[in-house]
Interface confidence: low
């Protein structure tokens, strides 16, 4: 019983349960391949508990190993469109500070219109995650087709 | 030491570790796009710890943020078949209570025969998740090709 | 406060937070379809906290339900290459002890050059996971394109 009470008394944040699920806000300016994200209950089923958004990019607030996941669907897309506009590639990486820039996860669309993947990776407080979509096709803003999230797993 | 003992004395369910992994039982009758799932140790590696099945659909028993994941492989499928029968689409959503009906995750097969994705989403006790497969192609019932699961992540 | 103290006093391992993320080391010799993995901070962002590597295969050290995830990208690949060399298939399974050999997750590449998926599955101490890539195409060793990992979720 003691454990359950103690667990209730402590703020969840002290248990390290940082988690975020974001929806697409908009694409970047010309020559900026980044996707810009938004999150919060007012926007639907997206949320940020711990991590924060900085100019549409996700910033980590707690050191640890995270599960990073993403799905991006291209708008107005068929397998013909996708192959004609190849290569369209999505990369998730640490983009800040720039000196530590590293690609964590990369996928090409080839003849498909959706990519989805996930991976475990260590992240540090202050790391900013960028999602770069290179190519001429635009992503869908439907919240069930394009989303990006992280989940703190362990220290 | 106190913590470990307390943890052992408490039922796991009180820690909020609701989790389920399901295998395909069958497809719905004509005009019903839903996939019907089954789970339990007698069936192999599927299980339900917390959530329950209600007429083949997954019902949530604990409020919280969940990681929802799915993989569906089409049976007797090649890239030619998949493109010829396009659009074949899978959607995972909350189908009950009707007032909360919403699509959480959607993917089209295009020229592929398998889709797989995952996302974080808030779910409430009583939410029932439906997986709708639209199109004329049938899913594989192989347990390593088609599966659906949820994992409670945090309150 | 008591809970936080107790949590700090216990080694993380006793909380059951076994986790691993691996990068591709090499493919097997002819007639051996297995992928051989490596992990550790010296190699970049891969790591093993709990599970171990045994001749390039991942061995589980703690009973429980695990989230298993994988992404494999084929090297020197286009949708034409992928379809020409079809079937190229990836399967993740328990390959030891031999008496429990079972396929957990299977995907074909069809006209794509990357597969990515994840699933929940019960694993037991001593289970060794093998990832079999069948076909003539080779996987990319780029750490952001090909990776394999597990995360302990609950007992």
């Amino acid at each position: 019983q003691r454990f359950a009470q103690a667990q209730q008394q402590l703020p969840l944040e002290s248990l390290g349960w940082d988690v975020a699920e974001l929806q697409l806000n908009h694409t970047g300016p010309q020559q900026d391949p980044r996707l810009y994200w938004q999150g919060g209950p007012a926007l639907g089923r997206s949320f940020l508990h711990g991590p924060e958004l900085d100019k549409g990019q996700l910033r980590i607030h707690r050191d640890g190993i995270y599960m990073v996941h993403i799905q991006v669907t291209l708008a107005i897309c068929s397998s013909t469109t996708a192959s004609r506009h190849h290569p369209t590639t999505l990369a998730v990486g640490i983009c800040s500070p720039a000196s530590r820039s590293i690609s964590l996860l990369r996928l090409s669309f080839h003849q498909g219109c959706t990519i989805a993947s996930q991976r475990l990776t260590p992240l540090a407080r202050g790391d900013t995650l960028c999602t770069n979509l290179t190519g001429t096709l635009l992503p869908s803003r439907n919240t069930d087709e394009t989303f990006f999230g992280v989940q703190w797993v362990r220290p | 030491q106190r913590f470990a003992q307390a943890q052992q004395q408490l039922p796991l369910e009180s820690l909020g570790w609701d989790v389920a992994e399901l295998q395909l039982n069958h497809t719905g009758p004509q005009q019903d796009p839903r996939l019907y799932w089954q789970g339990g140790p007698a069936l192999g590696r599927s299980f339900l710890h917390g959530p329950e099945l209600d007429k083949g659909q997954l019902r949530i028993h604990r409020d919280g943020i969940y990681m929802v994941h799915i993989q569906v492989t089409l049976a007797i499928c090649s890239s030619t078949t998949a493109s010829r029968h396009h659009p074949t689409t899978l959607a995972v959503g909350i189908c009950s209570p009707a007032s909360r009906s919403i699509s959480l995750l959607r993917l089209s097969f295009h020229q592929g025969c398998t889709i797989a994705s995952q996302r974080l989403t808030p779910l409430a006790r009583g939410d029932t998740l439906c997986t709708n497969l639209t199109g004329t192609l049938l899913p594989s019932r192989n347990t390593d090709e088609t599966f659906f699961g949820v994992q409670w992540v945090r309150p | 406060q008591r809970f936080a103290q107790a949590q700090q006093q216990l080694p993380l391992e006793s909380l059951g937070w076994d986790v691993a993320e691996l990068q591709l080391n090499h493919t097997g010799p002819q007639q051996d379809p297995r992928l051989y993995w490596q992990g550790g901070p010296a190699l970049g962002r891969s790591f093993l906290h709990g599970p171990e590597l045994d001749k390039g295969q991942l061995r589980i050290h703690r009973d429980g339900i695990y989230m298993v995830h994988i992404q494999v990208t084929l090297a020197i690949c286009s949708s034409t290459t992928a379809s020409r060399h079809h079937p190229t298939t990836l399967a993740v399974g328990i390959c030891s002890p031999a008496s429990r050999s079972i396929s957990l997750l299977r995907l074909s590449f069809h006209q794509g050059c990357t597969i990515a998926s994840q699933r929940l599955t019960p694993l037991a101490r001593g289970d060794t996971l093998c990832t079999n890539l069948t076909g003539t195409l080779l996987p990319s060793r780029n750490t952001d394109e090909t990776f394999f990992g597990v995360q302990w979720v609950r007992p």
Partner: antibody, heavy 120, light 107 residues
Framework: EVELVESGGGMVQPGRSLRLSCAAS????????MHWVRQAPGMGLEWVTV????????YYADSVKGRFTISRDNSKNTVFLQMNSLRAEDTAVYYC?????????????WGQGTMVTVSS | DIQLTQSPSFLSASVGDRVIITCRAS??????LAWYQQKPGKAPKLLIY???TLPSGVPSRFSGSGSGTEFTLTVTSLQPEDFATYYC?????????FGQGTRLDIN
């Protein structure tokens, strides 16, 4: 202290060339994109050109395309603007500015400017 | 090219006043807009970026809002040091462009 200092401005005749320099200090120069912006006397601001943090991309305003070249030397923490075939309408104060995010962000640090006068 | 039109071009106000400057883009630029303050003989200074984000060191009386094509810069309680020229800047498409400026004079 983070600082940008321009030099190389002066009076020059139409059709001639001039090379401006911008020396950076107080930050990791190789992490940032750099821009040149100019301001004709009594007028507003006009963006001229940008160079990526690693020199991999360069873009120019139509008014200077083919005449001006931006370059950088990360080992010397310096960005350059080579101005050829100068015209009277190129007369302005030239500012170098740091790109806030390394892609196309805002210009968070500016130099004090160097005056270029093109006149016969 | 994307045209940015600021209004008004000239503005007279007194210390303590609340002033609003608008910037209209000829096409959508998402949130990729910045505001600068420039005093005579000095380089511009960044006030707002990404439409509404304040850099450190900028007083909280400055705020920005808007997205798409309509943006505003608001100064809630003018201080003597705020009398200057203000420029908006779009960074969504090359070439990067600036508004024509708004000169804020003391009344």
């Amino acid at each position: 202290e983070v600082e940008l200092v321009e030099s190389g401005g002066g009076m020059v005749q139409p059709g001639r060339s001039l090379r401006l320099s911008c020396a950076a200090s107080g930050f990791t120069f190789s992490d940032y994109g750099m821009h040149w912006v100019r301001q004709a006397p009594g007028m507003g601001l006009e963006w001229v050109t940008v160079i990526w943090y690693d020199g991999s991309n360069k873009y120019y305003a139509d008014s200077v395309k083919g005449r001006f070249t931006i370059s950088r030397d990360n080992s010397k923490n310096t960005v350059f603007l080579q101005m050829n075939s100068l015209r009277a309408e190129d007369t302005a104060v030239y500012y170098c500015a740091r790109d806030e995010v390394g892609f196309v962000g805002a210009f968070d640090i500016w130099g004090q400017g160097t005056m270029v006068t093109v006149s016969s | 090219d994307i045209q940015l039109t600021q209004s008004p071009s000239f503005l007279s106000a007194s210390v303590g006043d609340r002033v609003i400057i608008t910037c209209r883009a000829s096409q959508g630029i998402n949130s990729h807009l910045a505001w600068y303050q420039q005093k005579p003989g000095k380089a511009p200074k960044l006030l707002i970026y990404y439409a509404s984000t304040l850099p450190s060191g900028v007083p909280s009386r400055f705020s920005g809002s808007g997205s798409g094509t309509e943006f505003t810069l608001t100064v809630t309680s003018l201080q003597p040091e705020d009398f200057a020229t203000y420029y908006c800047q779009q960074l969504n498409h090359y070439p990067i462009t600036f508004g024509q400026g708004t000169r804020l004079d003391i009344n």
